[in-house]
Interface confidence: medium
C-alpha cells in the first residue's frame, strides 16, 4: 500500500495473506468459513510451492492469538483467467477446515448486485504489499482510502486505454494506491466487498494508471457455484 | 525466454544405459516440478517420470512401464534436469520431451525432445 | 491406471465446421481436494504438444475462445466452434488426478 498506514490491529476480520513456502505472496479476503478470495495471477507463479493462507493477523512475523496459518485444499482460479489478461483474476480457496471464527477472524459480505459503485466513492484497500517504489515490505498490515474513478475517465487514452470492462473497477492512484504484493486483497466500499485487487505488474502511485480491481459483483454467479 | 532443451539421446543397445540431460532456463527452475514424457514414433504420448521441488522433498514418481529402471533427478543448482535409462528395451524408442509442471496446470512448456534408439 | 479413451481417432472436418473429440476415463477423475485435472493438448506436425485446456474447461494462455472444454468425473469433451487451419493435428487428453498420470490415445483432426 503507498501512502497508507498501519491499519487498526484486526479490525478487519476478513483480511487474508496467501502464502507461498511461508512468505507473504498475495492479499486474500475471507468471504465463507472455508473459502478466502484472492487473485488467480498470484499462484500462476507458485510452480511447486506450499500454498497456504493466514488469517487472524495484523503482524506478519510476530505472535498474535488469533493467527492461525492453513493449508490449502483446493485452489480454483476463475474458468476464464489468463496468464496475459487482466481479465477474470479471480482465486478461490478452499481451506483444509473451517476457520475458527472469532473477532479477529470474519467473513466478509460481498456485493452481489451488479451495480457500478459511484464515482468518488471512498473505499478502503489493505494489504501487506510495498509501501515505497524502493520495495519496502512492511511487518503490519497497511491500509488506505481511495475514491472511485469513473470507467470512461480510467478507460481514458492517457490511462488504461479501453482495457477496463464492466467486470473491473478503478480507484484513484495519486501517491496513494495498492501495490505489488497487495494483489487478491479486498476493496471494501461501505463495509461491503466490491472488488479484488488485480495483479498485474502495474505501476503503482501515479495518478495516470489507476488501481483495478475486479468486480466481485458481476462474477455472483461463479463464486456462489464454487462456494455451493 | 522460458526454454528447456534437452540432449544426451542416441542409440543403444538393448539392456543398455542412456542419460538424458535437459537445460532450463528463463525461469525459476528450483520451484517447479518437471516431468519426462516420451512418444514412441508414429504412438501417442506417454508420461514418464515427475520430480517435485526442493520444498516438496524432491518427491519422485514413475510410470509402471519404467519403475525400477528409469530414475529422474535434477540439479537446481545448474537448472538441469536428467533422466537415468538402465536396462533399456525397444520399447523404450521414443522421442523423450522434457515438461515443466504449473500450478495450475500441468505441461506448459515443453522441451523440442531428444530421440532415444534401442537397437541391436 | 486410469485408462482414458478417446474417440473419434480420426476427425475429418470442412475448415469452418465445428469439431467435437470425447474423452473418457475408466474411473473417476476428482482428485482428493476436489480438482479435475482434465487437460487437452494439441499436437501440430513436427512440433512438440501444446496446453489448451485445464482442469476441464480452463483456457490456457492465448488460446482462442474457439476452443472450449466440457465434462465431469469420466466423460469429457473438447470442442472447437469453428475449425481453422492452424488448428489442425493431434489431440490429446491427460488426466494428472491420479498418478500414474495418463494420456488418451489421440484424435487426428484433417481437412476432409
Known amino acids: 500500500i503507498l501512502g497508507g498506514r498501519e491499519a487498526e490491529a484486526h479490525a478487519r476480520p476478513y483480511m487474508a495473506s496467501v502464502q507461498l513456502n511461508g512468505a507473504h505472496l498475495c492479499g486474500g479476503v475471507l468471504v465463507a468459513e472455508q473459502w478466502v478470495l484472492s487473485a488467480a495471477h498470484c499462484l500462476e507463479d507458485a510452480a511447486d510451492g506450499k500454498v497456504q493462507v493466514l488469517l487472524g493477523a495484523h503482524s506478519l512475523s510476530q505472535p498474535e492469538p488469533s493467527k492461525r496459518l492453513y493449508d490449502v485444499l483446493r485452489a480454483v482460479p476463475h474458468p476464464d483467467s489468463q496468464p496475459d489478461t487482466i481479465d477474470h483474476d479471480l482465486l478461490l480457496l478452499q481451506l483444509s477446515e473451517k476457520a475458527t471464527l472469532g473477532p479477529a477472524v470474519r467473513p466478509l459480505p460481498w456485493q452481489r448486485v451488479d451495480r457500478d459503485v459511484a464515482p468518488g466513492t471512498l473505499c478502503d484497500v489493505a494489504g501487506w504489499g510495498i509501501v515505497n517504489h524502493a520495495g519496502r515490505r512492511p511487518d503490519s498490515l497497511q491500509h488506505v482510502l481511495l475514491p472511485v474513478l469513473d470507467r470512461a475517465t480510467c478507460n481514458r487514452r492517457t490511462h488504461h486505454d479501453g482495457a477496463i470492462t464492466e467486470r473491473l473497477m478503478c480507484a484513484e492512484s495519486n501517491r496513494r494506491d495498492s501495490c505489488k504484493g497487495d494483489s487478491g486483497g479486498p476493496l471494501v466500499c461501505g463495509g461491503v466487498l466490491e472488488g479484488v485487487v488485480t495483479s498485474g505488474s502495474r505501476v503503482c502511485g501515479n495518478r495516470k494508471k489507476p488501481g483495478i480491481y475486479t468486480r466481485v459483483a458481476s462474477y455472483a454467479a461463479w463464486i456462489d457455484s464454487v462456494l455451493a | 525466454e522460458v526454454q528447456l532443451v534437452e540432449s544426451g539421446g542416441g542409440l543403444v543397445q538393448p539392456k543398455g544405459s542412456l542419460k538424458l540431460s535437459c537445460a532450463a532456463s528463463?525461469?525459476?527452475?528450483?520451484?517447479?516440478?518437471m516431468n519426462w514424457v516420451r512418444q514412441a514414433p508414429g504412438k501417442g504420448l506417454e508420461w514418464v517420470a515427475r520430480?517435485?521441488?526442493?520444498?516438496?522433498?524432491?518427491?519422485?514418481y514413475y510410470a509402471d512401464s519404467v519403475k525400477d529402471r528409469f530414475t529422474i533427478f535434477r540439479d537446481d543448482s545448474e537448472s538441469m534436469l536428467y533422466l537415468q535409462m538402465n536396462n533399456l528395451k525397444t520399447e523404450d524408442t521414443a522421442m523423450y520431451y522434457c515438461?515443466?509442471?504449473?500450478?495450475?496446470?500441468?505441461?506448459?512448456?515443453w522441451g523440442t525432445g531428444t530421440t532415444v534408439t534401442v537397437s541391436s | 491406471d486410469v485408462l482414458m479413451t478417446q474417440n473419434p481417432l480420426s476427425l475429418p472436418v470442412s475448415l469452418g465446421d465445428q469439431a467435437s473429440i470425447s474423452c473418457r476415463s475408466s474411473?473417476?477423475?476428482?482428485?482428493?481436494?476436489?480438482?479435475?485435472?482434465l487437460e487437452w493438448y494439441l499436437q501440430k506436425p513436427g512440433q512438440s504438444p501444446n496446453l489448451l485446456i485445464y482442469?476441464?474447461?480452463n483456457r490456457f494462455s492465448g488460446v482462442p475462445d474457439r476452443f472450449s472444454g466440457s465434462g465431469s468425473g469420466t466423460d469429457f469433451t473438447l470442442k472447437i466452434s469453428r475449425v481453422e487451419a492452424e488448428d489442425l493435428g493431434v489431440y490429446y487428453c491427460?488426466?494428472?488426478?491420479?498418478?500414474?498420470?495418463?494420456f488418451g490415445s489421440g484424435t487426428k483432426l484433417e481437412i476432409k
Open positions: 491427460f488426466q494428472g488426478s491420479h498418478v500414474p498420470y495418463t
Open positions: 520430480i517435485r521441488s526442493k520444498s516438496n522433498n524432491y518427491a519422485t
Open positions: 515438461v515443466r509442471h504449473g500450478y495450475y496446470w500441468y505441461f506448459d512448456v
Open positions: 482442469n476441464v474447461f
Open positions: 474411473q473417476s477423475i476428482v482428485h482428493s481436494n476436489g480438482n479435475t485435472y
Open positions: 528463463g525461469f525459476s527452475f528450483n520451484t517447479y516440478a
